[in-house]
């Protein structure tokens, strides 16, 4: 569910939301580190209906959710890291 994602596209997000998204609507969370043409970290939530939401990395709910996911994955498998670059 949690994915560190490297992309050739510049910043994906223009506006970021702090609005809570319930876990049941979330398919995957992509974390785009700074760099690769974008000066800021971006967090992209893919919803199950294929829409995406750019979430403010400072939003408390997303920080809590990522912490829970990290703990859950560290107790089983490491967080998957996909250095996938879409051509």
């Amino acid at each position: 569910v949690l994915e560190v994602y490297y992309t050739s596209l510049r910043c994906r997000c223009v506006q970021e939301s702090s609005v809570f998204i319930p876990r049941r609507f979330i398919d995957r969370i992509q974390i785009l580190p700074r760099g690769n043409g974008c000066p800021r970290k971006e967090i992209i939530v893919w919803k199950k209906n294929k829409s995406i939401v750019c979430v403010d990395p400072q939003a408390e709910w997303i920080q809590r959710m990522m912490e829970v996911l990290r703990k859950r994955s560290s107790s089983t498998l490491p967080v998957p890291v996909f250095k996938r670059k879409i051509p």
Epitope: T7, L9, R12, V14, S17, S51, R84, I86
Partner: antibody, heavy 123, light 111 residues
Framework: QVQLQESGPGLVKPSETLSLTCTVS??????????VGWIRQPPGKGLEWIAH???????RYNPALKSRVTISKDTSKNQFSLKLSSVTAADTAVYYC???????????????WGQGTTVTVSS | DIQMTQSPSSLSASVGDRVTITCRAS??????????MHWYQQKPGKAPKLLIF???DLESGVPSGFSGSGSRTDFTLTISSLQPEDFATYYC?????????FGQGTKLEIK
């Protein structure tokens, strides 16, 4: 590199079902965020989106064609297919398969295209 | 459905000319600050080729003479100095709402 290749019969009789296949290389149909689809272009006219299918088998159809269209994929063969039933002369067109860029989900765009295959509907 | 209207439908121009093609959507194609409007070039007998995505982002490998601008419902594709290989048909496409829809095309011909 990314490649898409359409195949199928060039001639289909009215009222029959048109079946096309697109074979892809350079990417996997099962990769998260991946979508592929079909677009057609009648002779001398513009482009019309038909349908696309996502990595998780979620399918989206053009409402104008939905009752006659089925899109499917076979990940193991790196292929996806289009079936259009009850065809008429109005379905004569060049049919393109294409790959969605993979950045914005339902709000994405077509980044890569096959070269197209001409389908004529005639008896 | 969102209707896309391109103008002009056809255009005659000379090598070196600056050319602007417009595309108007029947409703806004913006979402979260991004315009989901894209431009393609198609040459006779060939598949369309992506030129511009998100209204103004140049696709990799596309010459810098192409540029896109606009927001909400009104968009333009500009070719700063026409080259012989630029004579083709150009299509806009919106992806903000299903079904994804294309403009009817603008045919750019040699004067």
């Amino acid at each position: 590199q990314v490649q898409l290749q359409e195949s199928g019969p060039g001639l289909v009789k009215p009222s029959e079902t048109l079946s096309l296949t697109c074979t892809v290389s350079g990417f996997s149909l099962s990769t998260f965020g991946m979508g592929v689809g079909w677009i057609r272009q009648p002779p001398g006219k513009g482009l019309e989106w038909i349908a696309h299918i996502w990595w998780d088998d979620d399918r989206r159809y053009n409402p104008a064609l939905k009752s006659r269209v089925t899109i499917s994929k076979d990940t193991s063969k790196n292929q996806f297919s289009l079936k259009l039933s009850s065809v008429t002369a109005a379905d004569t067109a060049v049919y393109y398969c294409a790959r969605i860029a993979g950045y914005y989900g339902s709000r994405d765009w077509f980044a890569y295209w096959g070269q197209g295959t001409t389908v004529t509907v005639s008896s | 459905d969102i209707q896309m209207t391109q103008s002009p439908s056809s255009l005659s121009a000379s090598v070196g000319d600056r050319v602007t093609i417009t595309c108007r959507a029947s409703e806004s194609v913006d979402n979260s600050g991004i315009s989901f409007m894209h431009w393609y070039q198609q040459k006779p007998g060939k598949a369309p080729k992506l030129l511009i995505f998100r209204a103004s982002d140049l696709e990799s490998g596309v010459p810098s003479g192409f540029s896109g601008s606009g927001s909400r419902t009104d968009f333009t594709l500009t070719i700063s100095s026409l080259q012989p290989e630029d004579f083709a048909t150009y299509y806009c496409q919106q992806s903000n709402k299903d079904p994804w829809t294309f403009g009817q095309g603008t045919k750019l011909e040699i004067k």
